[in-house]
Interface confidence: medium
């Protein structure tokens, strides 16, 4: 604590600015303004990353305004040193006390590669399970103390449901954050727009993403299913293929069923929708089945869930490994 | 030109600095130092993106040192305004002349997301055309005066062939640069490593990418071809599907042939290789054919070119629209 008989200095660093194009000048001046102190001996030291700098400081002479004094000290740095993300400290010793201010190059305000995506509900969740959800996904965040906030809203201004959040550290060291929001089936079908707002201390500004039901023409999918013939060396395994095509819009869910039971999604591999030569989309789905399965019941069903399919938004096709038997 | 009887001012903007962690303060002060002029009336105006600002400037009173005067004017901005990349100008009118300095937030010194990719030769170019090429692709570059340099080298130190370069402006305003290098078939098969080095003034450092023949186990592809049955409303069109699976490594070329002629790649759509449940990969390829084609000759061939296929690195399967006829 400072004793009563002197006014301590305020220490503030100013810096030379970038030009009107945002370019750094070849040299950067740091100006340490030490102001408003009772006249007396002061000592100014500059530190670079906490280490005392051996520099010719070009300290300006002290000026006095009324009963208080001000001093300024200028440090000139090469652009290289400034862009090296070093921290510079102006340290002032006065009346046995230390006062300081530190600065470094401002962090990039548009951090590399942070991206946000907002999905639409899957047709399966929307039409079969009747519990649609949408997911806001934020990828490539650098882990830091600051929290990523994902907030939901509706264009209609109506309240949103409670969302669930998940954070995952990726192998490349980045953070992936997802927030999943349940939406009303009717709200979605009637065209409500949902917004996800992403804020984070390191983001220059909030990222806004919105989603709503796809507009435009509708077309139901055509579904075709095929079984591969036996291949030498794999008698106990076959591959089933399903081609689903000419549907619009591109939102589709694909499932495989055996014995009236839906197989887990992990069992099959389905491609992302791609455009056909016409105006629709297509996907392929691939399922590996075992002899035990086809001997138990040799009928497998490929089912597409799509808003334009009727009745009940589904189209399916059965396929057998040995159709003639 | 200034007349001889006065010394014009120097105008320089200083700004408040970021803290020792590189974080922007909640408000940013711009300090316009107008110095070294013969005492006289001066007028200071601040502009934002060229528009006069309606602000309370808190201009400090003029000080005089010897025969010359100095004035300073301070502008306080919200962090939002500063981070939105606007240009601020301190404009000084003196003796009928205008003097100014401009500034804006310094450009990010580590620009976001430039990526480089280096492809392997397609099996078709390698084994059928016998003129393999590799392509170095640089995406998400901000267009600027600086040139992107892509330089090729070989791990063996042997010379490289002449490469061809292409630049393309994307719709999102970024630049895509590709460089294609012909490589020797034998060099590639024998395991030569090729390097692409990408340099650009805005890149924090050179990007190095290297490519060589994939190592690991080999497995030839299984090829299956299917035709879709007639679908209501599309009597004159059919879709052919080709499933190519269980191959290793993942490099594969897929072609369709009709009447012993290879159809243009644009005619078919082939998925990217995906992993099977086992250790291999699979792709699907889709081809739309017309009645005119199948009535001319009802045999279509799906051909896979892959290094593990024998003989001559190809496996093919024929399919007909009306197999029974």
């Amino acid at each position: 604590v400072c004793s009563r008989d002197f006014t301590p200095p305020t220490v503030k660093i100013l810096q030379s600015s970038c030009d009107g194009g945002g370019h750094f000048p070849p040299t950067i001046q740091l100006l340490c303004l030490v102001s408003g102190y009772t006249p007396g001996t002061i000592n100014i030291t500059w530190l670079e990353d906490g280490q005392v700098m051996d520099v010719d400081l070009s300290t300006a002479s002290t000026t006095q305004e009324g009963e208080l004094a001000s001093t300024q000290s200028e440090l000139t740095l090469s652009q290289k040193h400034w862009l090296s993300d070093r921290t510079y400290t102006c340290q002032v010793t006065y009346q046995g006390h230390t006062f300081e201010d530190s600065t470094k190059k401002c962090a990039d305000s548009n951090p590399r590669g942070v991206s946000a995506y907002l999905s639409r509900p899957s047709p399966f969740d929307l039409f079969i399970r009747k519990s649609p959800t949408i997911t806001c996904l934020v990828v490539d965040l650098a882990p830091s103390k600051g929290t990523v906030n994902l907030t939901w809203s509706r264009a209609s201004g109506k309240p949103v449901n409670h969302s669930t959040r998940k954070e995952e550290k990726q192998r490349n060291g980045t953070l992936t954050v997802t927030s999943t929001l349940p939406v009303g089936t009717r709200d979605w079908i009637e065209g409500e727009t949902y917004q996800c707002r992403v804020t984070h201390p390191h983001l220059p500004r909030a990222l806004m993403r919105s989603t709503t039901k796809t507009s435009g023409p509708r077309a139901a999918p055509e579904v075709y299913a095929f079984a591969t013939p036996e291949w030498p060396g794999s008698r106990d395994k076959r591959t089933l293929a399903c081609l689903i095509q000419n549907f619009m819009p591109e939102d589709i869910s694909v499932q495989w069923l055996h014995n009236e039971v839906q197989l887990p999604d992990a069992r099959h591999s389905t491609t992302q929708p791609r455009k056909t030569k016409g105006s629709g989309f297509f996907v392929f789905s691939r399922l590996e089945v075992t002899r035990a399965e086809w001997e138990q019941k040799d009928e497998f069903i490929c089912r597409a869930v799509h808003e334009a399919a009727s009745p009940s938004q589904t189209v399916q096709r059965a396929v057998s490994v040995n159709p003639g038997k | 030109v200034c007349s001889r009887d006065f010394t014009p001012p120097t105008v320089k903007i200083l700004q408040s600095s970021c803290d020792g962690g590189g974080h922007f303060p909640p408000t940013i002060q711009l300090l316009c130092l107008v110095s070294g002029y013969t005492p006289g009336t001066i007028n200071i105006t601040w502009l934002e993106d060229g528009q006069v600002m309606d602000v309370d400037l808190s201009t400090a009173s003029t000080t005089q040192e010897g025969e010359l005067a100095s004035t300073q004017s301070e502008l306080t901005l919200s962090q939002k305004h500063w981070l939105s990349d606007r240009t601020y100008t301190c404009q000084v009118t003196y003796q009928g002349h205008t003097f100014e300095d401009s500034t804006k937030k310094c450009a990010d010194s580590n620009p976001r997301g430039v990526s480089a990719y280096l492809s392997r030769p397609s099996p078709f170019d390698l084994f059928i055309r016998k003129s393999p090429t590799i392509t170095c692709l640089v995406v998400d570059l901000a267009p600027s005066k600086g040139t992107v340099n892509l330089t090729w080298s070989r791990a063996s130190g042997k010379p490289v062939n002449h490469s061809t370069r292409k630049e393309e402006k994307q719709r999102n305003g970024t630049l895509t640069v590709t460089s294609t290098l012909p490589v020797g078939t034998r060099d590639w098969i024998e395991g030569e490593t090729y390097q692409c080095r990408v340099t650009h003034p805005h890149l924090p450092r050179a990007l190095m990418r290297s490519t060589t023949k994939t190592s690991g186990p080999r497995a030839a592809p299984e090829v299956y071809a299917f035709a879709t049955p007639e679908w209501p409303g599309s009597r004159d069109k059919r879709t052919l599907a080709c499933l190519i699976q269980n191959f290793m490594p993942e490099d594969i070329s897929v072609q369709w042939l009709h009447n012993e002629v290879q159809l243009p790649d644009a005619r078919h759509s082939t998925t990217q290789p995906r992993k099977t449940k086992g250790s291999g990969f699979f792709v699907f390829s889709r081809l739309e054919v017309t009645r005119a084609e199948w009535e001319q000759k009802d045999e279509f061939i799906c051909r896979a070119v892959h290094e593990a296929a024998s003989p001559s690195q190809t496996v093919q399967r024929a399919v007909s629209v009306n197999p029974g006829k």
Epitope: G50 | G21, R205, A206
Partner: antibody, heavy 121, light 111 residues
Framework: EVQLVESGGGLVQPGGSLRLSCAVS?????????WEWIRQAPGKGLEWVAS???????NYNPSVKGRITISRDDSKNTFYLQMNSLRAEDTAVYYC??????????????WGQGTLVTVSS | DIQLTQSPSSLSASVGDRVTITCRAS??????????MNWYQQKPGKAPKLLIE???YLRSGVPSRFSGSGSGTDFTLTISSLQPEDFATYYC?????????FGQGTKVEIK
């Protein structure tokens, strides 16, 4: 002033494991910079081993990749080098350092005093 | 990897002598006009100390008798007038490309 202090060195048998620590004082490892391990075999030159960036990304010298893992504990302001399957040629003084960077190029500005690791049966 | 070769590997000199150490890189360490070459000093039982950055920039606090020069593949560290405290081993280091590598060192001994 920033200071780095290594610990955890000692005698270990070939095939064994060891975890070195580098305690940082005077600066938060989450604030910036890249944090490094560099080693020096007895009477030999210096070899960069591994680094961890303030954003958690890691880099390894290909000569040690797979046997060595760099990690950090922000709450302790400490970073670590986990060494497995140790060999006689891993015998060295291990230094931790703080790197300053310029456009992604790092140089080793502040060093610890070093800790000796001896791999011998 | 970029290999660095220093010469000589050792030298004997007297106080007041001018000493020159060279470092040759197996490929250029220049990038956009900057040379990514650094020089370190190491005394027995101590950690290395950074003397010079970017080929020729003297680190803050390093005496001005030390200087660095060169570009591309050839670099030089010069001590204009050797002082007793300068007897040590000097290493060059490139930070142009991963993995960063050091020269094998040059030991400066008292004649």
């Amino acid at each position: 002033e920033v200071q780095l202090v290594e610990s955890g060195g000692g005698l270990v048998q070939p095939g064994g494991s060891l975890r070195l620590s580098c305690a940082v004082s005077g600066y938060s490892i989450t604030s910036g910079h890249r944090w490094e391990w560099i080693r020096q075999a007895p009477g030999k030159g210096l070899e960069w081993v591994a680094s961890i960036h303030y954003d958690h990304s890691t880099n390894y010298n290909p000569s040690v990749k797979g046997r060595i893992t760099i990690s950090r504990d922000d709450s302790k302001n400490t970073f670590y080098l986990q060494m497995n399957s140790l060999r006689a040629e891993d015998t060295a003084v291990y230094y931790c350092a703080r790197a300053t960077h310029y456009f992604g190029h790092h140089h080793f500005a502040v060093w610890g005093q070093g800790t000796l690791v001896t791999v011998s049966s | 990897d970029i290999q660095l070769t220093q010469s000589p590997s050792s030298l004997s000199a007297s106080v007041g002598d001018r000493v020159t150490i060279t470092c040759r890189a197996s490929q250029s360490v220049d990038y956009h006009g900057d040379s990514y070459m650094n020089w370190y000093q190491q005394k027995p039982g101590k950690a290395p100390k950074l003397l010079i950055e970017w080929g020729s920039y003297l680190r803050s606090g390093v005496p001005s008798r030390f200087s660095g020069s060169g570009s591309g593949t050839d670099f030089t560290l010069t001590i204009s007038s050797l002082q007793p405290e300068d007897f040590a081993t000097y290493y060059c280091q490139q930070n142009a490309e991963d993995p960063y590598t050091f020269g094998q060192g040059t030991k400066v001994e008292i004649k």
